[in-house]
């Protein structure tokens, strides 16, 4: 019986630790995509609707804030698209990029953790264009550090929740 109790306590402890593991999956807020043709910061994301969820992390002022030290897997998926019904591209040569940036408040500094993308030729002869970027990596993050996303040409972002999103989940503690 003691073993049974110990086992169930162990399960409970494991489960509560898992439930406390920080994670976030943020999807683009399509009603508030900024304008610009150069690199801009995407600050409007959903954290509690559709596929978007957050636990033991904080989303504030367009940034994902780390609440627990640890090693985290960070990921971002950004889709760009253009259909001729919305008009013409003013230029057919495009640099379509995403930058995942870490900002530290304690020691004011900013670092690009990941970047991805390509230069594209989107010919005016085509009715539809699409390009997707996915980046992911494993990083040591400290409590209070902030993760943000920057993109080029935000007017070409695909606003669907399955197209433009980013997130993080803690994988292990820092020893």
């Amino acid at each position: 019986e003691k073993a049974m109790v110990d086992g169930s306590w162990l399960d409970l402890a494991k489960r509560s630790k898992l439930e406390a593991q920080p994670f976030a999956h943020l999807t683009i807020n399509a009603t508030d995509i900024p304008s610009g043709s150069h690199k801009v910061s995407l600050s409007s994301w959903y954290h509690d609707r559709g596929w978007a969820k957050i636990s033991n992390m904080t989303f504030s002022n367009g940034k994902l804030i780390v609440n627990q030290d640890g090693f985290y897997y960070l990921y971002a998926n950004i889709c760009f698209r253009h259909h001729e019904t919305s008009g013409d591209l003013a230029t057919e040569y495009l640099q379509l990029m995403v930058y995942v940036t870490k900002t530290s408040i304690k020691i004011p500094s900013s670092h690009t953790l990941m970047k991805g993308g390509s230069t594209k030729y989107w010919s005016g002869n085509s009715e539809f264009h699409f390009y997707s970027i996915n980046v992911g990596g494993f990083f040591k993050l400290r409590s209070g550090e902030e993760i943000s996303i920057e993109v080029s040409n935000p007017s070409l972002l695909d606003p669907d929740q399955d197209a433009t999103y980013f997130g993080a989940f803690k994988v292990r503690d820092i020893d």
Epitope: G36, S37, G87, L89
Partner: antibody, heavy 126, light 103 residues
């Protein structure tokens, strides 16, 4: 205030060319595209082409491809449309119009013509 | 190539009447539709863009609605100065126009 002022009426013989100017004022010329649209007597409006005043990129209707040239002089804030090999059916009022999409804020020419020139009547007759 | 079709081609109404003009696209164009007013000898004027957004300076009696392939321009109370030809437009394609006259 935003204004587009076009050159005066022209009369041309078939086979000749015509060049219409469109002087912009009241905004940063380089940040917008200029479209050319015409209306022949009793006909609907007809889009001819655009020029991105910032980088000079152009796009034309298939119908006018090879006969039309659109240029701009950023120092003079002026766009020009030249139509060659004129025929009688080119008799029309030619308009320039600004696209309301600001190229600094995005890269899509949206075909929303928010300001128009007063029109230039081009008559092609032998 | 998308074709825009307007109806009616002309209409006659009294001052104060509610006037509705319809525009159909040959395929779905989402909400990318604009309306213009043309008066003889004057520069055309953008009234509505993006199907329902009122261009600044345009009287509120003008309104637009619709999405997909069917759109309407409504003048809630026709005024003498509204005598003109009205055109719908999607990118490179214009409707054939609707001439509005006063009875």
């Amino acid at each position: 205030q935003v204004q587009l002022v076009q050159s005066g009426a022209e009369v041309r013989k078939p086979g000749a060319s015509v060049k219409v100017s469109c002087k912009a004022s009241g905004y940063d010329f380089s940040n917008y595209a200029i479209h050319w649209v015409r209306q022949a007597p009793g006909q609907r409006l007809e889009w001819m082409g655009w020029i991105n005043a910032g980088n000079g990129n152009t796009k034309f209707s298939q119908k006018f491809q090879g006969r039309i040239t659109v240029t701009r002089d950023t120092a003079a804030s002026t766009a020009y449309m030249e139509l060659r090999s004129l025929r009688s059916e080119d008799t029309a009022v030619y308009y320039c119009a600004r696209d309301r999409s600001n190229m600094v804020r995005g890269i899509i020419i949206a075909y929303y013509f928010d300001y128009w020139g007063q029109g230039t009547l081009v008559t092609v007759s032998s | 190539e998308i074709v825009m079709t307007q109806s009616p081609s002309s209409l006659s109404a009294s001052v104060g009447d509610r006037v509705t003009i319809t525009c159909r696209a040959s395929q779905s164009i989402s909400r990318y539709l604009n309306w213009y007013q043309l008066k003889p000898g004057k520069a055309p004027r953008l009234l509505i863009y993006g199907a329902s957004s009122l261009q600044s300076g345009v009287p509120s009696r003008f309104s637009g609605s619709g999405s997909g392939a069917e759109f309407t321009l409504t003048i809630s109370s026709l005024q003498p100065e509204d005598i003109a030809t009205y055109y719908c437009q999607h990118t490179r394609a214009f409707g054939q126009g609707t001439k509005v006259e006063i009875k």
